[in-house]
């Protein structure tokens, strides 16, 4: 039975040209995390494998940096980066947990971070 929950940074905004950290945290489970995949819509951005470490998609290697932790840092943001991001935790024996973050990249200098929220 899957008992874990994923806490994410929720809905966030950032300035064009800036950077942002996407963070998820899996709690309330003793399952072993074997891999975390970061996706934007249906595009794979990065993988953090428990055995083999970080792998960044060649398409994003200039703008994506691993960490902190299992999070992902997006750099040199453009308005095209606006959209949904997903952290997908592959665990044993539970299976897969998915967290969602919505990022809005703003032209203006006003960029407020949203509150944290939980996805069961």
């Amino acid at each position: 039975m899957m008992t874990g929950t994923i806490e994410t940074t929720g809905n966030i905004s950032a300035e064009k040209g800036g950077s942002i950290i996407l963070q998820c945290h899996l709690s309330s489970t003793t399952a072993q995390v074997t891999q975390v995949n970061w996706e934007q819509q249906d595009q794979l951005l990065a993988i953090c494998n428990a055995d083999l470490g970080w792998h960044i998609s060649p398409s994003f290697k200039d703008r994506v940096a691993p960490g902190p932790g299992l999070g992902l840092t997006l750099q040199s943001l453009t308005v095209n980066d606006t959209g949904e991001y997903f952290c997908i935790y592959h665990t044993y024996p539970d299976g897969t947990y998915t967290g969602r973050i919505f990022l809005e990249v703003l032209e203006s200098s006003v960029a407020e971070h949203g509150a944290r929220f939980q996805i069961p």
């Epitope: 993988i47 960044i56 897969t96």
Partner: antibody
């Protein structure tokens, strides 16, 4: 040309160990993952594990953890797969196969010729 | 682990006809899917990677499509050398990388 050449067929007793080698040539050995896949007679393909030849990091299928060890010798561009506590169900052809670059993920584009391992008392 | 399911298990086709093979993933693998061909007594050979890109030296009659969880390998006009077993494989989550059970394409 890029190729993987594996060691010859082996016959082992139950409980013994086997060590299969896979020598790579024609490309930069350290830059690509190496996988091991096995195929029991008349069955499908079963992934066993992966090694990063540059730094020696490995990841094994849970089914084989504790029984399999993958190593490499960068001086000879050779990877090794050792399987211990052999049982009859381990009778299979064992393949090494080159994966994607160690910076990303990829399909298995080059395969060794296979090594038949027979476990029989 | 991601379970890969291939259908049908066996496909009987006449030479010159089209063959369509299916592969389904138990969860999304995006486009990180490969197809392999294996003939008796031989090692598998990579046909398609990235769900739709032909590997070096693979004839144009082989094409792959799909994304997410549903994938198709199409052989537009079967040649005698195409009768073999075909496997799909996801390579986005490991351990373990997983293969489908295979589809045997046989002469009708």
């Amino acid at each position: 040309q890029v190729q993987l050449v594996q060691s010859g067929a082996e016959v082992k007793k139950p409980g013994a160990s086997v060590k299969v080698s896979c020598k790579a040539s024609g490309y930069t050995f350290r830059e690509y993952y190496m996988h091991w896949v096995r195929q029991a007679p008349g069955q499908g393909l079963e992934w066993m594990g992966i090694i990063n030849p540059s730094i020696g990091l490995t990841s094994y299928a849970r089914k084989f953890q504790g029984r399999v060890t993958m190593t490499r010798d960068t001086s000879t561009s050779t990877v090794y797969m050792e399987l211990s506590s052999l049982r009859s169900e381990d009778t299979a052809v064992y393949y090494c196969a080159r994966g994607g670059r160690t910076t990303w993920i990829g399909a298995l584009d080059i395969w060794g010729q296979g090594t038949m391992v027979t476990v029989s008392s | 682990e991601i379970v890969m399911t291939q259908s049908p298990a066996t496909l009987s086709v006449s030479p010159g006809e089209r063959a369509t093979l299916s592969c389904r993933a138990s969860q999304s693998v995006s486009s990180n899917l490969a197809w392999y061909q294996q003939k008796p007594g031989q090692a598998p050979r990579l046909l398609i990677y990235g769900a739709s890109t032909r590997a070096t030296g693979i004839p144009a009659r082989f094409s792959g499509s799909g994304s997410g969880t549903e994938f198709t390998l199409t052989i537009s006009s079967l040649q005698s050398e195409d009768f073999a077993v075909y496997y799909c494989q996801q390579y986005v989550v490991w351990p373990p990388l997983t293969f489908g059970g295979g589809t045997k394409v046989e002469i009708k």
